[in-house]
């Protein structure tokens, strides 16, 4: 009887381990505006908060500006990027801006980087208006393997809105890989 | 033997209760356009449908214009807000518009309101075009506690698109809090 | 004792079947640009990849340009649509564009089509700029029944960005229907 109970218990523990909702990895990272690069070209954003305000992480790792996957699975990835300019911040070099975000995946085993999602818009931000704002949102469902890294690239980083509700990205595991 | 089986059953029921997919709270609320406030300043939208068309709610509560959390957990929150103007609706007071959405969380215990997500754009809606349209989408993963309330604020509410496929917000629980 | 164990095992297997994370249907479909229709009016996009690059599908079916639901449930649906134009591609017929996406659900039992989500923007793409770009993202939580079909309609399909990171849509099951 004990052996049979142990077998049932073993099965139950196995299921518990695999399907227990609170085991699922996630991250919500918010921009750290103390270290935003300048320039208008595409750059990788490496400074993000993971443990203050809305920022949080569990069963994933944040290192060297990248979100590292610790557990194989299918994840929903998302990013929200806000750009803004007030005339008091200075004069823009061009009214014609390309405000873009790229969510990229890097595999260490095969050192290559691929864009999973992109979004954005060309904008005409004229000096005739004292304030300009624009936000991008992207999201999608991707297979991620342990050790793979997610990073964010943007154009015109000096125009980023530094608020935690404005510029962030994240991921949560939805299911295992079959 | 019965005691041991009861113990296994108890564990199983406990897991079933906690991880059963169909127990997970969710809501998808669509704009109720019969009661949209006017003006161009930021206002809280309090009229939403929760039980008609695409609108639905389960294990969450909609009250006083707010989506109330009944179950602690990590939730994916989202909002889609569409603005539109046709020249037959009248003349705009200004061509320079700030079309914004703010998804806010209010805690009753500590009566304070915080913005979880924001998005939008400044737009130039000229009289040279008979029709203007713009949509915002935001989404993110947040820890919510029972009793906390989610609400939506927008600028220029009189420009909201009243269709259920256009202006809505929602949430679904992804996992428990450890 | 065996009967009692069988009962526990039966319950356990039932739970495993229902809550096992890896049983959940999903799809992430990327644009197949070899067959994009022309024109500026609203058209249904029927050519999508389901098994190359980031595109993948499990426990759902892709047929005749539509994503078919095989399992009742509540799903999170999303779409990301990018439009772009470079002056080397030719002159636009009009600077005033309506760049839109519509995510629609069709029920075969009741042959009717309904829009679940829409997004987009009117844009002024002037000849003064050599390149224009704009992306739309929509997402929402919907009850889908087996046999229902999800499809994507857009305006100005000839302006679609053909990259897999740019123009895609998808779905993943979050929970069962009570």
């Amino acid at each position: 009887i004990r052996a049979e109970k142990a077998m049932v218990d073993g099965s139950w523990l196995d299921l518990a381990k695999r399907s227990k909702l609170e085991a699922q990895p996630f991250a919500h990272l918010t921009i750290n505006a103390t270290d935003i690069p300048s320039g208008s070209h595409k750059v990788s954003l490496s400074s993000w908060y993971h443990d203050r305000g809305w920022a949080k992480i569990s069963n994933m790792t944040f290192s060297n500006g990248k979100l590292i996957v610790n557990q194989d699975g299918f994840y929903y990835l998302y990013a929200n990027i806000c750009f803004r300019h007030h005339e008091t911040s200075g004069d823009l070099a061009t009214e014609y801006l390309q405000l873009m975000v790229y969510v990229t995946k890097t595999s260490i085993k095969i050192p290559s980087s691929h864009t999973l999602m992109k979004g954005g818009s060309t904008k005409y931000w004229s000096g005739n208006s004292e304030f300009h704002f624009y936000s991008i949102n992207v999201g999608g469902f991707f297979k991620l393997r342990s050790g793979e890294e997610i990073s964010i690239e943007v154009s015109n980083p000096s125009l980023l809105d530094p608020d935690q509700d404005a510029t962030y990205f994240g991921a949560f595991k939805v299911r295992d890989i079959d | 033997i019965r005691a041991e089986k009861a113990m296994v059953d108890g564990s199983w029921l406990d897991l079933a209760k906690r991880s059963k997919l169909e127990a997970q709270p969710f809501a998808h609320l669509t704009i109720n356009a019969t009661d949209i406030p006017s003006g161009s300043h930021k206002v809280s939208l309090s009229s939403w449908y929760h039980d008609r068309g695409w609108a639905k709610i389960s294990n969450m509560t909609f009250s006083n214009g707010k989506l109330i959390v009944n179950q602690d957990g990590f939730y994916y929150l989202y909002a889609n807000i569409c603005f539109r103007h046709h020249e037959t609706s009248g003349d705009l007071a200004t061509e320079y518009l700030q079309l914004m959405v703010y998804v806010t969380k209010t805690s009753i215990k500590i009566p304070s309101s915080h913005t979880l997500m924001k998005g939008g754009s400044t737009k130039y809606w000229s009289g040279n075009s008979e029709f203007h349209f713009y949509s915002i989408n935001v989404g993110g993963f947040f820890k919510l506690r029972s009793g906390e309330e989610i609400s939506i604020e927008v600028s220029n509410p009189s420009l909201l698109d009243p269709d259920q496929d256009a202006t809505y917000f929602g949430a679904f629980k992804v996992r428990d809090i450890d | 004792i065996r009967a009692e164990k069988a009962m526990v095992d039966g319950s356990w297997l039932d739970l495993a079947k229902r809550s096992k994370l890896e049983a959940q249907p999903f799809a992430h479909l990327t644009i197949n640009a070899t067959d994009i229709p022309s024109g500026s009016h609203k058209v249904s996009l029927s050519s999508w990849y389901h098994d190359r690059g980031w595109a993948k599908i499990s426990n759902m079916t892709f047929s005749n340009g539509k994503l078919i639901v095989n399992q009742d449930g509540f799903y999170y649906l999303y779409a990301n649509i990018c439009f772009r134009h470079h002056e080397t591609s030719g002159d636009l017929a009009t600077e005033y564009l309506q760049l839109m996406v519509y995510v629609t659900k069709t029920s075969i039992k009741i042959p009717s089509s309904h829009t679940l989500m829409k997004g987009g923007s009117t844009k002024y793409w002037s000849g003064n700029s050599e390149f224009h770009f704009y992306s739309i993202n929509v997402g929402g939580f919907f009850k889908l029944r087996s046999g229902e079909e999800i499809s994507i309609e857009v305006s100005n399909p000839s302006l679609l960005d053909p990259d897999q990171d740019a123009t895609y849509f998808g779905a993943f099951k979050v929970r069962d229907i009570d």
Partner: nanobody, 126 residues
Framework: EVQLVESGGGLVQPGGSLRLSCAAA????????MGWFRQAPGKGREFVTA????????GYVDSVKDRFTISRDNTKNTLYLQMASLRPEDTAVYYC???????????????????WGQGTLVTVSS
């Protein structure tokens, strides 16, 4: 590659006005951020003013604000500098400069500009 040729310099009395022009050839003028620099006798080259690609954003050094106005006509591929209330300390060789927008904000440093004209001399004296 863009070629720049300045004109309009000369001798003017203090308090007087002058308009400099800079004609651009080769390259798409509307894609360039344009600026004016000056070099007084025995001194280094200094930033005066710059204008965005479309002409709606302008930046000036404090000493010329409210006296000088930069403008451009993208249809004529020409940059202008309207100078009023001129002072003896404005005496310098004025250079027109161009660059593609590699920075978000108007570049004010000499090294941020890729193309230069030969310069035109402005002398403010009674």
């Amino acid at each position: 590659e863009v070629q720049l040729v300045e004109s309009g310099g000369g001798l003017v009395q203090p308090g007087g006005s002058l308009r400099l022009s800079c004609a651009a050839a080769g390259g798409t003028f509307r894609n360039y951020v344009m600026g004016w620099f000056r070099q007084a006798p025995g001194k280094g080259r200094e930033f005066v003013t710059a204008i965005s690609t479309g002409g709606s954003w302008t930046g000036y050094v404090d000493s010329v604000k409210d006296r000088f106005t930069i403008s451009r006509d993208n249809t004529k591929n020409t940059l202008y500098l309207q100078m009023a209330s001129l002072r003896p300390e404005d005496t310098a060789v004025y250079y027109c400069a161009a660059t593609t927008p590699a920075t978000t904000y108007l570049p004010r440093s000499e090294r941020q500009y890729d193309y230069w004209g030969q310069g035109t001399l402005v002398t403010v004296s009674s």
